[in-house]
Amino acid sequence: AVNGTSQFTCFYNSRANISCVWSQDGALQDTSCQVHAWPDRRRWNQTCELLPVSQASWACNLILGAPDSQKLTTVDIVTLRVLCREGVRWRVMAIQDFKPFENLRLMAPISLQVVHVETHRCNISWEISQASHYFERHLEFEARTLSPGHTWEEAPLLTLKQKQEWICLETLTPDTQYEFQVRVKPLQGEFTTWSPWSQPLAFRTKPAALGKDT
């Protein structure tokens, strides 16, 4: 038997993936555990194997279908269970009635590219990936720019309070290497959280023309 508190947190990417993390502060040695998803209004059910991500934390992804298929809706409720093998039986370690569109975390934005770069400014665009049509334009973004000699944590956050898949960065230093990241969040959902940050996009501003003020 396993003692101690556990935490079971899952997010829906709005299309065909539920990612779950289960933490258990009691010791679990060589125990096989899985997450089981059972929707209330559908015939399918899905299972994924929990794999360790730290000393007392396990994670897995429930793949519900093709990446862009709309496998759940705003009216679905999915019973999620953590099951761990005890001898020949499975023991329920955690359970929750999961409302997918109340627990959203989208995929990180993709296809970041420099549209136009100058000495002091840079226009960057991106795309959202595997986002449901339900959101229409009800998304917001956060962006950050890594300057030389600084860390990502020090970078100020730029907030875009609408579905705007581009940004014009101003007051940059000429002939300087920067990196840029963006993340996305739907406005919908009580427990919705930000997507992971996108892969960083590296760019360099143009050098100042000789003989001109910078």
Partner: antibody, heavy 117, light 111 residues
Framework: QVQLQQWGPGLVKPSETLSLTCTVS????????WSWIRQPPGKGLEWIGE???????NYNPSLKSRVTISVDTSKNQFSLKLSSVTAADTAVYYC???????????WGQGTLVTVSS | QSVLTQPPSVSGAPGQRVTISCTGG?????????VHWYQQLPGTVPKLLIY???NRPSGVPDRFSASKSGTSASLVITGLQAEDEGDYYC???????????FGGGTMLTVL
């Protein structure tokens, strides 16, 4: 293997209420959602509504004001009531396993309901 | 007028291949919802032929296959047989209507 058997009157007068019942055999009504679908003569299929064992219902918005679907788990049955019928409600009515978010299988044998005075 | 659009009729000779299309919009097929197909032979109850875009229930011959791309889906019947004659319907979910929707049906004639 789950089978559906439906019954009800084949003739209903205009402005009255159409009533049909479907019995689930070979399985439990508690296992899933159950739907009603209709097909006017020579025409296509139209989803009417659905229910589960606990009585949770969803209806087609175009019929919602006139439709009531109920369930009796002790008899493994679910029922359809459609009020204020007109000739346009003349159709073959089917019960089927499945929610409107899913596919429908199995199907009942169908009941032709004619609305006429 | 059906939410999903199918050709009213298609025909083919025995042994031939026929395709039935099903075109939807941005709130149903194009939104990523699964498409299901039914066969209704003359005077009979509709029968599930394909579920979740491409899957055949047990007992359905592999002459029947289906695919989905963008806002449309297709049912393909190869090696056409006389007993395939009947009506074929596609079905999906529509998030605007919050209801299951069907195509108008396609009558298949085997020449």
């Amino acid at each position: 293997q789950v089978q559906l058997q439906q019954w009800g009157p084949g003739l209903v007068k205009p402005s009255e209420t159409l009533s049909l019942t479907c019995t689930v055999s070979g399985g439990s009504i508690s296992s899933y959602y159950w739907s009603w679908i209709r097909q006017p003569p020579g025409k296509g299929l139209e989803w009417i509504g659905e229910i589960n064992h606990s009585g949770s219902t969803n209806y087609n918005p175009s019929l919602k004001s006139r439709v009531t679907i109920s369930v009796d788990t002790s008899k493994n049955q679910f029922s359809l009531k459609l009020s204020s019928v007109t000739a346009a409600d003349t159709a073959v009515y089917y019960c089927a396993g499945g929610s409107n978010l899913d596919w429908f299988d199995p199907w009942g044998q169908g009941t032709l309901v004619t609305v006429s005075s | 007028q059906s939410v999903l659009t199918q050709p009213p009729s298609v025909s083919g000779a025995p042994g031939q291949r026929v395709t039935i299309s099903c075109t939807g919009g941005s709130s149903n097929v194009g939104a990523g919802y699964d498409v299901h197909w039914y066969q209704q032979l003359p005077g009979t109850v509709p029968k599930l032929l394909i579920y979740d875009n491409t899957n055949r229930p047990s007992g359905v011959p592999d002459r029947f296959s289906a695919s989905k791309s963008g806002t449309s889906a297709s049912l393909v019947i190869t090696g056409l047989q006389a007993e395939d004659e009947g009506d074929y319907y596609c079905q999906s979910y529509d998030s605007s209507l919050r209801a299951s929707v069907f195509g108008g049906g396609t009558m298949l004639t085997v020449l």
